[in-house]
Interface confidence: low
């Protein structure tokens, strides 16, 4: 008959690694007599028999469960009980364990050159994941520019071009790899002009071709623009290769132009522009140019459109960068500034200005203004608009109107050259010629001419409103 | 539902050491670092440091170097900051804090305060 | 050791827009993330890795980050948006955790 014997652990429980959702088995060999009973602890608290998430088989000396959990962490012992010499205990642990899973993987982006751009790639496991990123089919290489961030983002700052291309990042620990999806990052790069269009000197009615070539990520568009406004005679072609647009302008020149190549792409709501530009000369009409710093073209304005003769060409000065939109904002500042005269003052004030900011000039002839003729400018100062002249001059005197009157676009009626020495050398203003008769009340004002130079005057049904300040200086 | 519960409000005598504990809830708590970051009256945030749970791997702010100490205890997901040799100037509140996969915070523990008083 | 300067106070009447600026050597270079917390509170996370909101987090809480200024841009501010603000950055050098100095938003 065998003697009692006290129970004795011959294998100690062991520290056990185990991933979530498999099993875990601790083995606790007892040698005994009689057969020990045993029984299991957590972490000092007794393991139940009936517990279905455990399974205790061999006699109670295996303890399997059956699939762990982040919370069956901890210590787990064993204690052996034969009624002979005390009970005894071999504790181990429980270490769960966690293959990496990737929790916030990255997304695809678009990006503009030059900005910074972040992949997020957030991972959970146990050992802490290391994240590494892969471009392409190779490992990202960390510099400057480009870092994987403690939080396992990929952080490219100053994104360039060759930064485009499809990424992933890896999530690895000692229990294994886990890979995100491959992500697209779009660098978008703003509209740039690769070869402007270039200036030409050419013959009257000769034909040109304006070539201005952008690129951009989104390809660009190409628009154009002549003196200002959208090109309104010419052909356009277009082509597109590789990112790189190609626009060609055919034009039939009949007048000196500044043409304007704007090229344009979107980056989501915003727009990002470019611009070069090319001037188109007439070669006959250069030998005077030094004299007659502008060209000859068709009023495309508002606030004259009323005054000047239906398609007749005016001057445009290109000592403005640029002239027609220069010489409107001119006029439409002298009439927002105009306070009101009298209607008699109104329309003279209206004719006289806009024929003196927008001068007759024809083709075919050097581009020199053709500037009001001086009686037509007494008229307005001397008889139409003589009270508010008056006024104006008076309050110039007390120093009231010192700051800027020299940039009113209004001309010095004495240096303006008189029609009876060469009618052809100067503007007639056809508002103001009507029989002066028609004038119910003529100031008495000393005229610096002889009122025969006074023309005979007609009334006028325009109504633009002139403030002294601005029409008679 | 994640949570970091800390333990209450402590008075202590300069000179001496406070323990304060962060247990945490609803997550692997050997998953994630843990941060230490205190605030005095008035003041702004000042972090401390961490401690890796799982390998019981500190850093610690130069500020703090040699009088505190991060513990952790990864049987029950609680860790544990001690500061010694306290002075009036540690008077302030002590927050846990972890970030779950992010290098930011997102989850806070509701603050300890501790006073230093003679 | 990093340093990150923010404005002591910011104020914004209702339904305006609030900016609070975060200054460090090359931040853009750095994640940034910001805080918000009420008095008696624990801090919040409104924006981390320069312009992520957390789940729960309104839209009308956005930020950026360059060169040497991050921003947090509270849009269409409300009276609850009133509170302290701190910016934060993991030093990769030291391995360290920094905190801006904080800034106060009072709504008006």
């Known amino acids: 008959e065998k003697l009692p014997k006290a129970p004795v652990i011959t294998t100690p429980l062991e520290t056990v690694d185990a991933l979530v959702e498999e099993v875990a088995t601790f083995m606790c060999a007892v040698e005994s007599y009689p057969q020990p009973e045993i029984s299991w602890t957590r972490n000092k608290i007794l393991i139940k028999l009936f517990d279905t998430r455990y399974s205790i088989r061999e006699n109670g000396q295996l303890l399997t469960i059956l699939s762990v959990e982040d919370s069956d962490d901890g210590i787990y012992c064993c204690i052996a009980n034969n009624g002979v010499g005390g009970a005894v205990e071999s504790c181990g642990a429980l270490q769960v364990k966690m293959k990496p899973k990737i929790t916030r993987p990255p997304i695809n982006v678009k990006i503009i050159e030059g900005l910074k751009a972040v992949l997020p790639c957030t991972t959970m496991g146990n050992p802490k994941p290391s994240v590494s990123w892969i471009k392409g089919d190779n490992a990202l290489r960390e510099n400057s520019r480009i870092a994987v961030l403690e939080s396992g983002s990929l952080r490219i700052h100053n994104v360039q071009k060759e930064d485009a291309g499809q990424y992933r990042c890896v999530a690895k620990n000692s229990l294994g790899t886990a890979y995100s999806k491959l992500v697209k990052l779009e660098v978008e790069v703003f509209a740039r002009i690769l070869r402007a269009p270039e200036s030409h000197n050419v013959t009257f009615g000769s034909f040109v071709t304006l070539r201005c070539t952008a690129i951009g990520i989104p390809v660009p568009t190409i628009s154009w623009i002549e003196n200002g406004n959208a090109v309104s005679s010419g052909s356009i072609q277009e082509s597109v290769k590789d990112r790189v647009i190609d626009s060609r302008l055919q034009l039939f020149i009949t007048k000196p132009g500044l043409y304007t190549c704007i090229a344009t792409n979107k980056h989501g709501e915003k727009f990002s522009t470019a611009k070069a530009a090319a001037t188109v000369s007439i070669a006959e009409w250069s030998k005077s140019q030094k004299d007659s710093q502008g060209y000859c073209a068709q009023y495309r304005g508002e606030v004259c459109d009323a005054v000047l003769a239906k398609d007749a060409l005016v001057f445009f000065n290109t000592s403005y960068r640029d002239p027609e939109d220069a010489q409107e904002l001119l006029i439409h500042t002298a009439w927002n500034e105009l306070k009101a005269v009298s209607p008699l003052c109104r329309p003279a004030a209206e004719a006289l200005l806009c024929n003196h900011l927008f001068q007759e000039c024809s083709p075919g002839v050097v581009p020199t203004p053709m500037p009001i003729c001086r009686e037509y400018c007494l008229a307005v100062k001397e008889l139409f608009c003589a009270k508010e002249w008056q006024a104006m001059e008076g309050k110039a005197h007390r120093g009231l109107y010192r700051s800027g009157m020299h940039l009113l676009p209004v001309p010095e009626c004495s240096k303006l050259p008189s029609m009876h020495r060469d009618p052809t050398a100067c503007t007639r203003l056809p508002y103001l010629d009507y029989k002066k008769e028609n004038i119910t009340t003529f100031p008495s004002i000393t005229s610096s001419r002889p009122s025969a130079d006074i023309p005979n005057l007609p009334a006028s049904t325009s109504s633009f409103a002139v403030s002294p300040a601005y029409s008679m200086t | 539902q994640v949570h970091l519960v800390q333990s209450g409000a402590e008075v202590k005598k300069p000179g001496a050491s406070v323990k304060v504990s962060c247990k945490a809830s609803?997550?692997?708590?050997?998953?994630?670092?843990m941060h230490w970051v205190r605030q005095a009256p008035g003041q702004g945030l000042e972090w401390m440091g961490w401690?890796?749970?799982?390998?019981?791997?500190?850093s610690y702010a130069q500020k703090f170097q040699g009088r505190v100490t991060m513990t952790r205890d990864t049987s029950i997901s609680t860790a544990y900051m001690e500061l010694s040799r306290l002075i009036s100037d540690d008077t302030a509140v002590y927050y846990c804090?972890?970030?779950?996969?992010?290098?930011?915070?997102?989850?806070w523990g509701q603050g300890t305060m501790v006073t230093v008083s003679s | 050791s990093y340093v990150l300067t923010q404005p002591p106070s910011v104020s914004v009447a209702p339904g305006q827009t609030a900016r609070i600026t975060c200054g460090g050597n090359?931040?853009?270079?750095?994640?940034v993330h910001w805080y918000q917390q009420k008095p008696g509170q624990a801090p919040v996370l409104v924006v981390y890795?320069?312009?992520d909101r957390p789940s729960g987090i309104p839209e009308r809480f956005s930020g950026s980050n360059s060169g040497n200024t991050a921003t947090l841009t509270i849009s269409r501010v409300e009276a609850g948006d009133e509170a302290d603000y701190y910016c934060?950055?993991?030093?990769?050098?030291?391995?360290?955790?920094?905190f801006g100095t904080g800034t106060k938003v009072t709504v008006l």
């Open positions: 804090a972890s970030g779950l996969g992010i290098s930011a915070f997102d989850i």
């Open positions: 609803g997550y692997t708590f050997t998953g994630y670092y």
């Open positions: 401690i890796n749970p799982y390998s019981g791997g500190t």
């Open positions: 090359n931040i853009g270079s750095k994640s």
């Open positions: 890795d320069d312009s």
């Open positions: 934060q950055v993991w030093d990769r050098s030291s391995d360290h955790y920094v």
